[in-house]
Structures are given as structure tokens and as C-alpha cells.
């Protein structure tokens, strides 16, 4: 058995359903996406040995599903997947990778062929711990590269300042596939949000530890860089689920109420 979870049940139905649903979010001139053709292109990877799938195997899939990303709306992330999805709000606020068509259809899904057979493996799929060229990692590598290349304007990045190995994973999709593919001439600046989990450990904040590494890397590449600790709009969203926690006390609101009284 592999280390990862097996192929998601009803993979094809979920994929096609998400694709059809997403088309409504696209501008009229981009709405002519053929979801069946996109599925067939994706399925190429499902016909290969589960440790022999390369990012390039998804080229046709990307070409068929690719669309423009609004300027200033890109939101990259590490170790904050659910928070990013909630905050982006189905493209309303931002458009992270999971909110572009080619990311949406695969978000939180798993897939692979059986090792010595043609059917899908519903028991387990390989992770990077099993083999590098596995279907899921190769997919997200290819998708991440495309997402970076198509991003423009102000680039936003949400990182987790409560992550034990550091807010900026030196070995991660953002470091290895997204930063190198940012198109400098299309980007005005990069804004980082270091979010801390409510009640979680304070591992790093802006200008500390691995964040110094990230800042140096981006500045060396010629990018304008800014960093915000616990970006307030996102912090307010986190506090929805922790309204009584001391970190969520609305000090300014309380002060305003007192003044009124």
C-alpha cells in the first residue's frame, strides 16, 4: 500500500460537476470550456504507472482549462489551505489556485491508477514519500507553474506563522514551483500575510527566521516586498470560530462603544 489516500470516490462525477459549476463564474468570452475534453485530457495521467506521471503529462489539460486571472487577485499560500479557500470566497475576494478552473476541479481530491492494472486504485495512492513522479504531486506542480505565470499586479501570499517548521517552507510548492515562475515584468509588488492560528504557537512573524530567507530571496529577485502580521480581514475570519478567545477581542470596537456610552 502507498502512503497517500486512494482515488476519491466518484472522481469523474465530481470533476465534471465542478467544471460545469465553475464555467458560470467565468466571463462570457471564457465560458466556452469543454468539460468533457478537459476530463479526457486529465485522464491521460490515470492511464500511467502511478510513479511515472510527469508534470508535463498535464500540459493538454492545462491548455484546455486555462483562463486569465484578474490582476491583483492572485493569492498564493502554504499551510493555510482551508483558510485561503474560506477567505477567497469562491473568487469573490481573491482567486487562489483552488479558485481557477484547473485547480478547482482537483482541489482536495486524490487519484491514481493501480500499480499493475488498468483500473483506479481506491485503496491508496503514492505521495512524495513514496515516489516523486506521482499523479497528484505532478498535477499540482504543473498547475502551480501555470498559476504563477498567469499572475499579475499585486501578488498576495498567505503563510502560517504557527507552522512548526517555519512560516516559509524552504521545500514547498511556493518555494520550488511558484516563486521561480513569477513574471517580474507583470508584478508590481508582493504582499505577504503571516497568519497565526488562534490559540496556536507563535513560531514566526514577519522578519523572523524563515521569513528573513523569503524576504531576501524575493528582494534579490528584484521584487518589491511587504509583510503584514495577522492581516486583519483574515484574522476576523479566523475569529468567527473563536469569538471568545482573547486573541479575538475587538479592542477598537469596545473602545468605540465605551466612548459612545
Amino acid at each position: 500500500r502507498w502512503r497517500g489516500e486512494g482515488t476519491s470516490a466518484h472522481l469523474r462525477d465530481i470533476f465534471l460537476g465542478r467544471c460545469a459549476e465553475y464555467r458560470a463564474l467565468l466571463s462570457p468570452e471564457q465560458r466556452n470550456k469543454n468539460c468533457t475534453a478537459i476530463w479526457e485530457a486529465f485522464k491521460v495521467a490515470l492511464d500511467k504507472d502511478p510513479c511515472s506521471v510527469l508534470p508535463s503529462d498535464y500540459d493538454l489539460f492545462i491548455n484546455l482549462s486555462r483562463h486569465s486571472i484578474p490582476r491583483d487577485k492572485s493569492l498564493f499560500w502554504e499551510n493555510s489551505h482551508l483558510l485561503v479557500n474560506s477567505f477567497a470566497d469562491n473568487t469573490r475576494r481573491f482567486m487562489p489556485l483552488s479558485d481557477v478552473l484547473y485547480g478547482r476541479v482537483a482541489d482536495f481530491l486524490s487519484w491514481c491508477r493501480q500499480k499493475n492494472d488498468s483500473g483506479l486504485d481506491y485503496q491508496s495512492c503514492p505521495t512524495s514519500e513514496d515516489c516523486e513522479n506521482n499523479p497528484v504531486d505532478s498535477f499540482w506542480k504543473r498547475a502551480s507553474i501555470q498559476y504563477s505565470k498567469d499572475s499579475s499586479g499585486v501578488i498576495h501570499v498567505m503563510l502560517n506563522g504557527s507552522e512548526p517548521t517555519g512560516a516559509y517552507p524552504i521545500k514547498g510548492f511556493f518555494a520550488d514551483y511558484e516563486i521561480p515562475n513569477l513574471q517580474k515584468e507583470k508584478i508590481t509588488r508582493i504582499e505577504i500575510w503571516v497568519m497565526h492560528e488562534i490559540g496556536g504557537p507563535n513560531v514566526e512573524s514577519c522578519g523572523e527566521g524563515s521569513m528573513k530567507v523569503l524576504e531576501k530571496r524575493l528582494k534579490d529577485m528584484g521584487f518589491q516586498y511587504s509583510c503584514i502580521n495577522d492581516y486583519r480581514p483574515v484574522k476576523l475570519l479566523q475569529c468567527v470560530d473563536h469569538s471568545t478567545h482573547p486573541d479575538c477581542a475587538l479592542k477598537s470596537a469596545a473602545a468605540a462603544t465605551q466612548r459612545k456610552a
Epitope: P164, T165, I170, K171, P201, N202, E204, G207, E208, G209
Partner: antibody, heavy 117, light 109 residues
Framework: QVQLKESGPGLVQPSQTLSLTCTVS????????VSWVRQPPGKGLEWMGI???????AYNSLLKSRLSISRDTSKSQVFLKMNSLQTEDTATYYC???????????WGQGVMVTVSS | QFVLTQPNSVSTNLGSTVKLSCKRS????????VNWYQQHEGRSPTTMIY?????PDGVPDRFSGSIDRSSNSALLTINNVQTEDEADYFC????????FGGGTKLTVL
């Protein structure tokens, strides 16, 4: 230049508490993480725990119940406290600096601690 | 939590090339970097290689790091071995915490 220096008692009685101090210079404790690592005589290295730049801590699960790491950023000092010492805790204790919490770029000279009655 | 296994001791001739291995017990090094430290007798460790293959300033380019996927091992290669290379070498990686290999004692003949 970057320096870390451990200090503390060379001899501790069994069942007593060990208190060590790591005094750093050339960098800020709010910019770099500091770990404690120990090495019994003639043996390998064992990671004990870390105090992150944000002030939170994490510990080796085998030592967690008797270990505490804290700091005083104004004095550029990191402290280790470990209780219920046994003879197998005899080791050289090092503090080490990290820019990411996953590897060490600078080490202290170490302090040898013997647990014996 | 995985274990990192290193040979206890390795002997090599002056001027030759030696490869020190660090084998991971479960999983591979795909999602975790490996770092290497040198420790001379009675001294504190110093970083020789970090993030698989990067050399800190001041470390001779005779030292290099790599990952051998076929054997699921990290390798520290020392070219043109010198007498001052005689020391203990520790590999290190991480998962939920820092993990060290048991160390290899390198003897230069």
C-alpha cells in the same frame, strides 16, 4: 560575529533539576530560533527542543514531560530547565541557532554536565 | 518518526574520494531536506552541507551533498580527502522534530 555560549553547573545530583543558560551575541532572539541539543560521551547528537522566534516552544517527545525552555530577549539569553535527572542525562549540552527551524547554522561550544552523587 | 542510519565508521586514504551515506528508514527525502555536520574530537559540530547540497561560506568545495533516490539515502562526498577531514559526521533531517543520524567516524589513513 555570531556567538552562542552555554553556562551552568558541571555536576548535578541524581533526581535534581538542571538549569543551563545560553547567552548569544551577534543576532537577535526575535529573528532566529534556538535549539538545545545534547551528546552523551562517545555517542550521537539528540535534539531536545526549540524556542521559536515568536517565543513558543516545542520539545522532543521523549523529554517533553521534564523539559522547559524559555528566554529573556532583553538579555539575549535562552534557558533550559530539566528535572528528575538520571545518570543517563550525563552529556555535553549545546545550544544552536537556526534561521529556519529545520537545521542549525551556528553552535555553542557546549557545556559538559555530569549527573552523579 | 523515521530513523536515519549511518555506518559507524569509514576509513579512507589521504587524497582519495569517500562517500558517507545516511539512509532513511521510511519514506524518502522528497519533502525533507538533509543537513550534514562535522565534529572534530572535543569540539562542537559545524555545518558542512545544508538543504541537501548547499555549502556554507568557508566550507571547502571538496565537500558536496546529494540524494541517491535509488537507495533512499543522502550522501556526503569528500573529494581529495585531507587529514583534517578526520572527524565524526552527522546527517540530520526533520519531521515532527529534528532527527539526527547516529554519526560516522571518518578515519584518514
Amino acid at each position: 560575529q555570531v556567538q552562542l555560549k552555554e553556562s551552568g553547573p558541571g555536576l548535578v545530583q541524581p533526581s535534581q533539576t538542571l538549569s543551563l543558560t545560553c547567552t548569544v551575541s551577534g543576532f537577535s532572539l526575535t529573528s532566529y530560533h534556538v535549539s538545545w541539543v545534547r551528546q552523551p560521551p562517545g555517542k550521537g547528537l539528540e535534539w531536545m527542543g526549540i524556542i521559536w522566534t515568536g517565543g513558543s516552544t516545542a520539545y522532543n517527545s521523549l523529554l517533553k514531560s521534564r523539559l522547559s525552555i524559555s528566554r529573556d530577549t532583553s538579555k539575549s539569553q535562552v534557558f533550559l530547565k530539566m528535572n528528575s535527572l538520571q545518570t543517563e542525562d550525563t552529556a555535553t549540552y549545546y545550544c544552536a541557532r537556526s534561521i529556519t527551524p529545520t537545521f542549525f547554522d551556528y553552535w555553542g561550544q557546549g557545556v559538559m554536565v555530569t549527573v552523579s552523587s | 518518526q523515521f530513523v536515519l542510519t549511518q555506518p559507524n565508521s569509514v576509513s579512507t586514504n589521504l587524497g582519495s574520494t569517500v562517500k558517507l551515506s545516511c539512509k532513511r528508514s521510511t519514506g524518502n527525502f522528497g519533502s525533507n531536506y538533509v543537513n550534514w555536520y562535522q565534529q572534530h574530537e572535543g569540539r562542537s559540530p559545524t555545518t558542512m552541507i545544508y538543504r541537501d547540497d548547499k555549502r556554507p561560506d568557508g566550507v571547502p568545495d571538496r565537500f558536496s551533498g546529494s540524494i541517491d533516490r535509488s537507495s533512499n539515502s543522502a550522501l556526503l562526498t569528500i573529494n581529495n580527502v585531507q587529514t583534517e577531514d578526520e572527524a565524526d559526521y552527522f546527517c540530520q533531517s526533520y519531521s515532527s522534530g529534528i532527527v539526527f543520524g547516529g554519526g560516522t567516524k571518518l578515519t584518514v589513513l
